[in-house]
């Protein structure tokens, strides 16, 4: 007789989740010499231990502490790029500007990027059928708590000028309910961070509006200023051109005024 299984509103665990995490860990530690000491089997065991046999609506940051400890990594604190609702461009950028890092350029972020996972209370099974949705089911689910934990730690580590890429095509360019707006903004350390520099990425080809004057950007400025951190904003009018010029700065079209 098949056991009754809780039906959640969100998609289930990504297929081949354990193999994917392990393979990503091995690949990352091969590419990044400073993380060669990491034992990927121990990393997987710690990852698994955070959510297996636990109710998927009752996960805490403490559950992830063994994984956080194993994945401790030092990135240059003044080279951090945060992003909100524009992940692909942020990742394209750090692939070109190799000295800057998004959360997904760190081991823990790389392991979990685009993956979903959850377990079941009192069984060692991974639930491949469904996992809790943040809105419809519960916020303290394995995926949400993981990203909240690593995002908080990433923001806490930042110093000097911190950059954030924001999507200028969205109705809320800055969204207080995003991970950036609800977690990272509030965990930047004013004693270490001098400035938050927002890059507003334009979507329209001929869009020359100053999106730094958007009301939601003003709201972000207000939140940041109240935390005694300086705020500044840049329009990236043509992200394709910007990326091209970061990649090939000596290109003649990147050294002449338009």
């Amino acid at each position: 007789v098949p056991r009754w299984r809780q039906q959640w509103s969100g998609p289930g665990t990504t297929k081949r989740f354990p193999e994917t995490v392990l393979a990503r860990c091995v690949k990352y530690t091969e590419i990044h010499p400073e993380m060669r000491h990491v034992d990927c089997q121990s990393v997987w065991d710690a990852f698994k231990g955070a959510f297996i046999s636990k109710h998927p609506c009752n996960i805490t940051e403490e559950d992830y502490q063994p994984l956080m400890k194993l994945g401790t990594q030092t990135v240059p604190c003044n080279k951090i790029l945060l992003w909100s609702r524009i992940k692909d461009l942020a990742h394209q950028f750090t692939q070109v500007q190799r000295d800057m890092f998004t959360l997904e350029d760190t081991l823990l972020g790389y392991l979990a990027d685009d993956l979903t996972w959850c377990g079941e209370f009192n069984t060692s099974k991974i639930n491949y059928q469904s996992c809790p949705d943040w809105r419809k089911d519960c916020s303290n689910n394995p995926v949400s708590v993981f990203w909240k934990t690593v995002s908080r730690r990433f923001a806490e580590a930042a110093c000097d000028v911190v950059h954030v890429m924001l999507n200028g095509s969205r109705s809320k360019i800055f969204d207080k309910n995003s991970t950036f707006g609800s977690v990272e903004v509030h965990n930047l350390q004013p004693e270490k961070v001098q400035t938050l520099e927002a890059w507003v990425i334009h979507g329209g080809r001929e869009d020359s509006r100053d999106l730094c004057q958007d009301p939601t950007i003003k709201e972000l400025e207000s939140i940041i200023s109240k935390r005694n951190i300086q705020f500044s904003c840049k329009n990236i009018y043509r992200p394709d051109k910007f990326l091209q010029c970061v990649k090939n700065p000596e290109d003649s079209s990147c050294t002449s005024e338009i």
Epitope: E197, D210, Q213, F242, P249, E257
Partner: antibody, heavy 120, light 110 residues
Framework: SVEESGGRLVTPGTPLTLTCTVS????????MGWVRQAPGKGLKYIGI?????NIYYANWAKGRFTISKTSTTVDLRITSPTTEDTATYFC??????????????????WGQGTLVTVSS | AYDMTQTPASVEAAVGGTVTIKCQAS??????LNWYQQKPGQPPKLLIY???TLAFGVPSRFKGSGSGTEYTLTISGVESADAATYYC????????????FGGGTEVVVK
């Protein structure tokens, strides 16, 4: 053109307002920056008034200076001068330009500067 | 901040010689680097912007180059009129003003 005025000898603690008067420049279209230079020293940015009315200060200048503007002037108030504020104060137009998919700026028009001496 | 480090602090050049001044930013400024010339008793004058674009009326013996965090001003065929102090400045973000100018390089022409 850009012209600074108001520089003079003041005693420490006496507030002083410097005025940058522009002609042929629309302050609703251009930002104006204040830069100072102590005798024999380099250039140091104090702050900037953007065309939209936003004001940015260097961290070291916060609380020590106040920038404001009218239709043809941008004022710099030194709130409580100390001897370290002895310098030539320059006002400069900031011109934004586009390149590489984004924009940047340059200080393309400077006044002659006005000398402030703080001494007891 | 975008700390701008300029080297050397002072350099001597013979008439007709070449002078090279370097400017390093603590973070990438994406080619938005300006160079200014200042003579004693005068305000600074814009020489080069966007790393390599000559400002109006500036002689072609002045050349700017570089990208990312590393920039160079080269004066070829130095003339006595080039004796001055030269400053670099980041033009990437005017909302970040601390140390946006380099410390300056004095060029002495012999």
């Amino acid at each position: 053109s850009v012209e600074e005025s108001g520089g003079r000898l003041v005693t420490p603690g006496t507030p002083l307002t410097l005025t940058c008067t522009v002609s042929g420049i629309d302050l609703n279209s251009y930002a104006m920056g204040w830069v100072r230079q102590a005798p024999g020293k380099g250039l140091k940015y104090i702050g900037i008034m953007t065309s939209g009315g936003n004001i940015y200060y260097a961290n070291w200048a916060k609380g020590r200076f106040t920038i404001s503007k009218t239709s043809t002037t941008v004022d710099l108030r030194i709130t409580s001068p100390t001897t370290e504020d002895t310098a030539t104060y320059f006002c400069a137009r900031e011109r934004e330009f586009y390149g590489g998919g984004t924009s940047g700026s340059r200080l393309d028009l400077w006044g002659q500067g006005t000398l402030v001496t703080v001494s007891s | 901040a975008y700390d701008m480090t300029q080297t050397p602090a002072s350099v001597e050049a013979a008439v007709g010689g070449t002078v090279t001044i370097k400017c390093q930013a603590s973070q990438s400024i994406y080619n938005f680097l300006n160079w200014y010339q200042q003579k004693p008793g005068q305000p600074p004058k814009l020489l080069i912007y966007y790393a390599s674009t000559l400002a109006f009326g500036v002689p072609s013996r002045f050349k700017g180059s570089g990208s990312g965090t590393e920039y160079t001003l080269t004066i070829s065929g130095v003339e006595s009129a080039d004796a001055a102090t030269y400053y670099c400045q980041q033009g990437w973000n005017s909302g970040i003003l601390d140390n946006s100018f380099g410390g300056g390089t004095e060029v002495v022409v012999k």
